[in-house]
Structures are given as structure tokens and as C-alpha cells.
């Protein structure tokens, strides 16, 4: 029997009955075996077919078979009910081989010309399957010449059988306190030949609870326990399962913080799988009872491991852990069922004892010693000699723990000394002056350094004086011996003050005239104000109306008297202001250089002489009474004059203080 071509030769060709196109002889049997390469099939069709027709093609026939299967038995010229002729049909091998057998019997009633057929190898499309047949590949099928291959969707891997897609469903770890997990593709059928492992791993102290939800469908067997597909649940304590079938398993309270779920499937079946909703529980902590005047947030039915709550206090109450104040408070439930921190208290805010007010006092309004939230205190200044600056002295204990004024200030009020108070009612003299009485010039300051000089107290820690009087001590302020509250220059009974710093006007030039002859001394401590020590006022803007020509000012000091000695007792003199042009003219003639009297000076004295300030009075104040406020203010500072004090036609020259108010205010506010 002739064999057809064998692969790897090119597989195509022609077959024909013996003697074709002539008639074929009786008793012929011819067999062709065609073989195509793997992954290919053979296609065969007839271009001519003329064989004796017989019932079921028993006499003459062409038989096509592939492996053990007969594809067709052919005879005649055209098909009948019981016989088949090829006509225009194309025949395909089932695999890569095709057997063709031709046979004729012992006789023919008439001549038959036989057949002619052509064949060729062609690629099999393994990816195309007949309806109802199992697909070639689980997921994706890829045909190519001579074969095919399968591939899988993301999350799957090709099984070693090269067709099935096994799910990549292991190594998933669930760490949240609750969640859901299900079989791959749920609720669609789960994959074959898969082994899935899921882990639930919670912090120690939690216990996992498993609930099967919705539906459960895992391949089962009527007699054997889950031999095909199964679900198992493992904890460190015990194993649950295996589970299969269609009944939802009951809730599983694992009493464990770690759970491993294993799901194994075989190569067959079409089942939807399972879905688990897991939750967790833990030993609850005692229910947090809010302390009085506080509240708990968030409010929960119960608090378990990792749950927390915060305490918030009502306005005016603060969080205290015993004696320890807390900015905030949050407690966390621990695995042993205890809170990690003790419950605090909401204690009423206590502002504490109010600070002492220098030169003042404090009074408890709400009640003796009451310093808690909304308590009221009243500060007041020592009467007569001090007055409260800016606020009314009423302070309330606010929620932030600070005593706060009605204007919202948290700083203490200030008791400012009352200025310009004097016991004196009428006038007298210094050079040609009169003895001062106690309380007449309580601002008077005696300055002892290289020489004797004077000054005037401003506020309770500044002294106003002449620049020339303290020039030598400007770099050694501590050398100044400052005394106040006494009338007698040599008395041992006085209030001592010491200088912290000396500020000489930057426009003053020593030994080159007396322009800008003004200085400030800052004391290193505040002095206590009383009837004998009271500051002088600085002039108001309107003060010039009390310092016109012929208005009376008063100078005081321990300077030279008519007898030529420093006064033992504080002396004073009332002198009128002199017209500025008249004074300028008086000091234009020699020995005085032109321009000695400047706009920063004022003059006072009598044309006839006899009343004047003198050496030793330098730096002292020339004061005037403000009749509107009934307070004394400093209009001038004893600066210079004629060599012979009280000389007729000459006048005492004083630094004009009103010109220096900005300078004084700047120094005092800066230092």
C-alpha cells in the first residue's frame, strides 16, 4: 500500500484511483497514509468522483479515517439517503494523520472512472471548540502555526497542565479590625486547581469573629467529607472545617488574634464559593464616667482594645491629673482591659493669689481669698500720693488662669505717683529768699557729687536736672549721692537714692554755653512717695499760658545765699518771668558772648535784683502753679546767670523745659 508523504516534507499533493482518468479495474485496493506535522491537520477534497453505487457503499468505496475514527465512506456520484458521495465537501483529519482507502469489488456493471483528490496540511486552530465542548484554555487561548498556548488574567498563574489558570490567592494579610474576604471571583465560579491562603493578623488582645455571609457553594461529595474542594480555618488554638457544600457554616468565634484560612480547589466543577465578613472584639475597658464639669468624647456603647476617649472640661475648668495640669487628655484601652491613663479631674481654674501692686493694694470682692474662675478682685492705689494709670483696677479670674482687667489686660495696673502736690500756699525767696517748710517742695532733690547741685523728682524713679550739674559724673553715675525728703542739707535724716544712669542732652556742649542744659538721672530703685517726697509735673501743652512775662515762678535750693554760703535749710524765692528780648539784651554786653540766651531758655528775676537762684541751686526746678489742675509743674531748670547773683539788670537763666518734653518722654519710655 503506497504511503503518502511524511512530514517534514511539504505536505500537499494529489491522489487518484488506479488508471485515472481511465476506468479503474476490479479487485483493486489502494491505501494512502498522510501525515502532517504536529499541530497541523490534513484537508482533502475531490475534484472528480465516479464510483459504483451500492447499498451502504459495500461494493466499491473510498474510506477516509483519522486514527480509529472513520470520517466518511464514499461511493456513487451523488449522495442518496443511505450513501454518500463527496460532492464539493472538504474533509479534515482529526489529528495530524489521514488514512485514505480505495477498494473495488470483483465486478462493475458499467465502467467507472474513479476519483481524483487533492490534499494539503493546514494549521489547526485549537482555540476554536465546538459548542458544548470544554474550552481549550481556562482564560486566554492563543493559536499559532503548529500549535497554541494558554495565558491567564492578572492574579492567576498557568498550572503545570498548561491549560488551567490557578488563582494567585496566597499571602494576603488582613490587619484591620474588621473586613471581608472571599473566594477568588466570588460570586462567579472560583478557579480550578488553586490553593489559597488568607491571614487575619490583629494586635495581641483582639479576638477574631468570622461570619459566613450571602451564599456558600463549594464542591462536595455525598459520601466523603470534602474530597474535591474545601475551606479550612486554622488558629493557634484549633482547626475549623473542612467546609464544603451549599450550607452557610455557623459563626466562628476564634478567641485568637491570628487566623489562617485555606481554600483548595481541584480541576473540575463550577461553584460560586464563599464570602466571610470578619470582625474583632477584645476585653472591654471600664466605661469612662466623665468627671464633674467635664464630658467624654466620643461616646460609645463600649470601649475595647485601641479604642480611645478624650475628656473636655467646661469653660472655667481645667484638666488636672491630681496636681498636674494637662493640656489635653486622651486615654487608650489596653489589651488587659484597663485604660492606659487615670481619669483626670476637671477642676475649677484657679488664678492663684494676685500679685502685689507696688504702691497699691488688692481687695477680694467675691470672697476672702477666693481666686477661682470668675472671682473678682479690686486693685487700688495708695490714696493721695498715687493714682491708677489706664484701667479701673477691677480684675476677673478668666478661664485661661490669668487675672484679667475689663480691657482684657493681663498685666498689673500701674500706680503712678501724683505729681505737683505741695503744702505751700504763698511765696518767698532764696537769694533774698525764705526758708521752705516741710511739704513745700517735695520734688526737691539734693545732688552731691563733685559739687552741690539740685534736681526735681519726676515720677518715682527719675530726676530732672541741669546737664552742667552732672556732666562730670555722666560716665560714673554711681558716684552721684542723691538725697530727698529733707529740708536740711546736712541732716542725717533723708531718703537715699542712687543713680543707675545719667542721660545728658545730646545738644549740650560743656564749657561752650548753656544751650540744651538739661539731663535726666534714672534711679536704680523707685522711691516711696509721701508728703515729703512727691514728683513735680511736666508742663502740659497749655502750660505756656501760665508762663507769660511777669507770671510768677518759684525756685528752690540750698545754693549760696546773700551771706555767701550754701544754705543749711532749703530756701525758695518767687520770681517773675522776664521778657525774652529784655533778657537777651541784658546778656549781649561783655563779658557775655553774643547769643548766650537762646530760644531754649527762659529768664526770671527782678530788674532791681535781689531775688535770684545762685551757685548750688543748679539743676533745681523753677515751678509754676497750673491753676486749672491746681498742680505745680516744672517750667525751668536752674542753669546760669550773672557772676553776682541777684544783680540789678541781670536775670537768672533757666532751661525752658516745655521745649524738651519729647526728649524727656523718649528717654523715660526707652529706659
Amino acid at each position: 500500500t503506497p504511503l503518502g508523504p511524511k512530514w517534514p516534507e511539504p505536505v500537499f499533493g494529489r491522489l487518484a484511483s488506479p488508471g485515472f482518468p481511465g476506468e479503474y479495474a476490479n479487485d483493486q485496493e489502494r491505501r494512502w497514509t498522510l501525515t502532517a506535522p504536529p499541530g497541523y491537520r490534513l484537508r482533502l477534497y475531490f475534484t472528480h468522483f465516479d464510483l459504483e453505487l451500492s447499498h451502504l457503499c459495500e461494493y466499491d468505496f473510498v474510506k477516509l479515517s483519522s486514527g480509529a475514527k472513520v470520517l466518511a465512506t464514499l461511493c456513487g456520484q451523488e449522495s442518496t439517503d443511505t450513501e454518500r458521495a463527496p460532492g464539493k465537501d472538504t474533509f479534515y483529519s482529526l489529528g495530524s494523520s489521514l488514512d485514505i482507502t480505495f477498494r473495488s469489488d470483483y465486478s462493475n456493471e458499467k465502467p467507472f472512472t474513479g476519483f481524483e483528490a487533492f490534499y494539503a496540511a493546514e494549521d489547526i486552530d485549537e482555540c476554536q471548540v465546538a459548542p458544548g465542548e470544554a474550552p481549550t484554555c481556562d482564560h486566554h487561548c492563543h493559536n499559532h502555526l503548529g500549535g497554541f498556548y494558554c495565558s491567564c488574567r492578572a492574579g492567576y498563574v498557568l498550572h503545570r497542565n498548561k491549560r488551567t489558570c490557578s488563582a494567585l490567592c496566597s499571602g494576603q494579610v488582613f490587619t484591620q479590625r474588621s473586613g471581608e474576604l472571599s473566594s477568588p471571583e466570588y460570586p462567579r465560579p472560583y478557579p480550578k486547581l488553586s490553593s489559597c491562603t488568607y491571614s487575619i493578623s490583629l494586635e495581641e488582645g483582639f479576638s477574631v469573629i468570622l461570619d459566613f455571609v450571602e451564599s456558600f457553594d463549594v464542591e462536595t461529595h455525598p459520601e466523603t467529607l470534602c474530597p474535591y474542594d474545601f475551606l479550612k480555618i486554622q488558629t493557634d488554638r484549633e482547626e475549623h472545617g473542612p467546609f464544603c457544600g451549599k450550607t452557610l457554616p455557623h459563626r466562628i468565634e476564634t478567641k485568637s488574634n491570628t487566623v489562617t484560612i485555606t481554600f483548595v480547589t481541584d480541576e473540575s466543577g463550577d461553584h460560586t464559593g464563599w464570602k466571610i465578613h470578619y470582625t474583632s472584639t477584645a476585653q472591654p475597658c471600664p466605661y469612662p464616667m466623665a468627671p464633674p464639669n467635664g464630658h467624654v468624647s466620643p461616646v460609645q456603647a463600649k470601649y475595647i482594645l485601641k479604642d480611645s476617649f478624650s475628656i473636655f472640661c467646661e469653660t472655667g475648668y481645667e484638666l488636672l491629673q491630681g496636681h498636674l495640669p494637662l493640656k489635653s487628655f486622651t486615654a487608650v484601652c489596653q489589651k488587659d482591659g484597663s485604660w492606659d491613663r487615670p481619669m483626670p479631674a476637671c477642676s475649677i481654674v484657679d488664678c492663684g493669689p494676685p500679685d502685689d501692686l507696688p504702691s497699691g493694694r488688692v481687695e477680694y470682692i467675691t470672697g476672702p481669698g477666693v481666686t477661682t474662675y470668675k472671682a473678682v478682685i479690686q486693685y487700688s492705689c495708695e490714696e493721695t500720693f498715687y493714682t491708677m494709670k489706664v484701667n479701673d483696677g477691677k480684675y476677673v479670674c478668666e478661664a485661661d488662669g490669668f487675672w484679667t482687667s475689663s480691657k482684657g489686660e493681663k498685666s498689673l495696673p500701674v500706680c503712678e505717683p501724683v505729681c505737683g502736690l505741695s503744702a505751700r500756699t504763698t511765696g518767698g525767696r532764696i537769694y533774698g529768699g525764705q526758708k521752705a517748710k516741710p511739704g513745700d517742695f517735695p520734688w526737691q532733690v539734693l545732688i552731691l557729687g563733685g559739687t552741690t547741685a539740685a534736681g526735681a523728682l519726676l515720677y518715682d524713679n527719675w530726676v530732672l536736672t541741669a546737664a552742667h550739674a552732672v556732666y562730670e559724673q555722666k560716665h560714673d553715675a554711681s558716684a552721684l549721692d542723691i538725697r530727698m525728703g529733707t529740708l536740711k542739707r546736712l541732716s542725717p535724716h533723708y531718703t537715699q537714692a542712687w543713680s543707675e544712669a545719667v542721660f545728658i542732652h545730646e545738644g549740650y556742649t560743656h564749657d561752650a554755653g548753656f544751650d540744651n542744659d538739661i539731663a535726666l538721672i534714672k534711679l536704680n530703685n523707685k522711691v516711696v512717695i509721701n508728703s515729703n517726697i512727691t514728683p513735680i509735673c511736666l508742663p502740659r501743652k497749655e502750660a505756656e499760658s501760665f508762663m507769660r512775662t511777669d507770671d510768677i515762678g518759684t525756685a528752690s535750693g540750698w545754693g549760696l545765699t546773700q551771706r555767701g554760703f550754701l544754705a543749711r535749710n532749703l530756701m525758695y524765692v518767687d520770681i517773675p518771668i522776664v521778657d525774652h528780648q529784655k533778657c537777651t539784651a541784658a546778656y549781649e554786653k561783655p563779658p557775655y558772648p553774643r547769643g548766650s540766651v537762646t530760644a531754649n531758655m527762659l529768664c526770671a528775676g527782678l530788674e532791681s535784683g535781689g531775688k535770684d537762684s545762685c551757685r548750688g541751686d543748679s539743676g533745681g526746678a523753677l515751678v509754676f502753679l497750673d491753676s486749672e489742675t491746681e498742680r505745680w509743674f516744672v517750667g525751668g531748670i536752674v542753669s546760669w546767670g550773672s557772676m553776682n547773683c541777684g544783680e540789678a539788670g541781670q536775670y537768672g537763666v533757666y532751661t525752658k523745659v516745655i521745649n524738651y518734653i519729647p526728649w524727656i518722654e523718649n528717654i523715660i519710655s526707652d529706659f
Partner: antibody, heavy 118, light 112 residues
């Protein structure tokens, strides 16, 4: 004035429990913490824990967790300390002390002697 | 826990003479509000402890001003300017900044 009156001495057997009391007077009981302090014979002082009667919230030194249980009865202004599973190591004088904003120990009770002996 | 170390263990002083006790903590006792919660207690023989000083240097009412407390951070001192007979007993420092509160080892003051 603030007073803390403690219960009398106790002689107890090993393994037993004992509950000692501290009755407060002279102030609002629910406003201040009560501390408990242990002093073994001839030894120093150890803070056991405290309780705030205003919220019935107790806090323990880790060393005394499971050994001491602090409670209060606000109706009688009394604080209690229950000592359980007693051993000879628990033989000591136990003091209660009332705290305030200045700290936990401005006011002290007179002490309760607990002796554990078979 | 914060460890409180007191020195000396015993102090023998003549009446009228000064005395000084040191207390060191294993960590700073400064609290977040800027205050340092360190107390000194005196336990006279057979009595309950009595607080002498709180917040490092504040004297409790009725405590004589011969007692002074000082220090900061982790280093503290109790000084008695002139010891009197009633001062004998055991002195304890105690920190109340950190939980649990911890006491010093104690210093026994004896009268010579």
C-alpha cells in the same frame, strides 16, 4: 480642718484578703485625690496608687496592679484599699494621703498596720 | 520608673548647726508647665510622714523658715540652717512629676 482617719491594725493569714479604710473629713470628699502609700517595717515609702472620688477613677503603680484595689464610698466619705492574695511581703504600714493642687501628699492619715502571718 | 537617690543615708548633727541633704533623680523632674514637682517629707519616729516642702522650694504652712529647698532638673538639696531637737527623723524626697511617684531612699537625721 482636713482629717484622714484610718482603720485599725489587721492580722491576716497568707492567701487571704484585707480591706482597710480611710475616712475623710473637713473638706469636700469628691474634690480631691486619695493616695495610698506602703511602708514596710524599717523601710522606705512606696506609692501604691490613687483614686479620684469625683469619678471613681483609680490609677495604680504597675507594681501593685492585681495586688491592690482602690474604691470609695462617697456617701460616707471613705476610701478603701483591698489587698488580696496576701504574703509576708505585704506586711507593712499603709498610709492614705489626700492630694491637692500643690501635690499628692500634703495631708496624711495615721497609717494602718497589716501583718500577714500563719 | 524614676529612681531617687538620697545622700547621705545618715546625718549626725549638733543642735544649732546646719544640715544639708542631697537628692538626685534619674531624669529631669521639670513638668511641661515649667514647674518642678519635687517634695521633701519628714517622718518623725512612730509618726506619719509630714510634708515640709513642695515645688522644690515652697514651704508648707507651719514649717519653720530654717528649712530651705533648692535645685532644678534632677539635682535637689534640703538645707536646715540651724538644727533643732524636733528636726530628728527620716527625711524623704519624693518626685511627683512622673508616674508612678517615687520616693528617695531616706536620710536619717540624728542629734549628736
Amino acid at each position: 480642718q482636713v482629717q484622714l482617719q484610718q482603720s485599725g491594725p489587721e492580722l491576716v493569714k497568707p492567701g487571704a484578703s484585707v480591706k482597710i479604710s480611710c475616712k475623710a473629713s473637713g473638706y469636700t470628699f469628691t474634690d480631691y485625690y486619695i493616695n495610698w502609700v506602703k511602708q514596710r517595717p524599717g523601710q522606705g515609702l512606696e506609692w501604691v496608687g490613687w483614686i479620684f472620688p469625683g469619678s471613681d477613677s483609680a490609677y495604680y503603680n504597675e507594681k501593685f496592679k492585681g495586688k491592690a484595689t482602690l474604691t470609695v464610698d462617697t456617701s460616707s466619705s471613705t476610701a478603701y484599699m483591698l489587698l488580696s492574695s496576701l504574703t509576708s511581703e505585704d506586711s507593712a504600714v499603709y498610709f492614705c494621703a489626700r492630694g491637692d493642687r500643690s501635690g499628692p501628699f500634703p495631708y496624711w492619715g495615721q497609717g494602718t498596720l497589716v501583718t500577714v502571718s500563719a | 520608673d524614676v529612681v531617687m537617690t538620697q545622700t547621705p543615708l545618715t546625718l549626725s548633727v549638733t543642735i544649732g548647726q546646719p544640715a544639708s541633704i542631697s537628692c538626685k533623680s534619674s531624669q529631669s523632674l521639670l513638668y511641661s508647665n515649667g514647674k518642678t514637682y519635687l517634695n521633701w517629707l519628714l517622718q518623725r519616729p512612730g509618726q506619719s510622714p509630714k510634708r515640709l516642702i513642695y515645688l522644690v522650694s515652697k514651704l508648707d504652712s507651719g514649717v519653720p523658715d530654717r528649712f530651705t529647698g533648692s535645685g532644678s532638673g534632677a539635682d535637689f538639696t534640703l538645707k536646715i540652717s540651724r538644727v533643732e531637737a524636733e528636726d530628728l527623723g527620716v527625711y524623704y524626697c519624693v518626685q511627683v512629676t512622673h508616674f508612678p511617684f517615687t520616693f528617695g531612699t531616706g536620710t536619717k537625721l540624728e542629734i549628736k
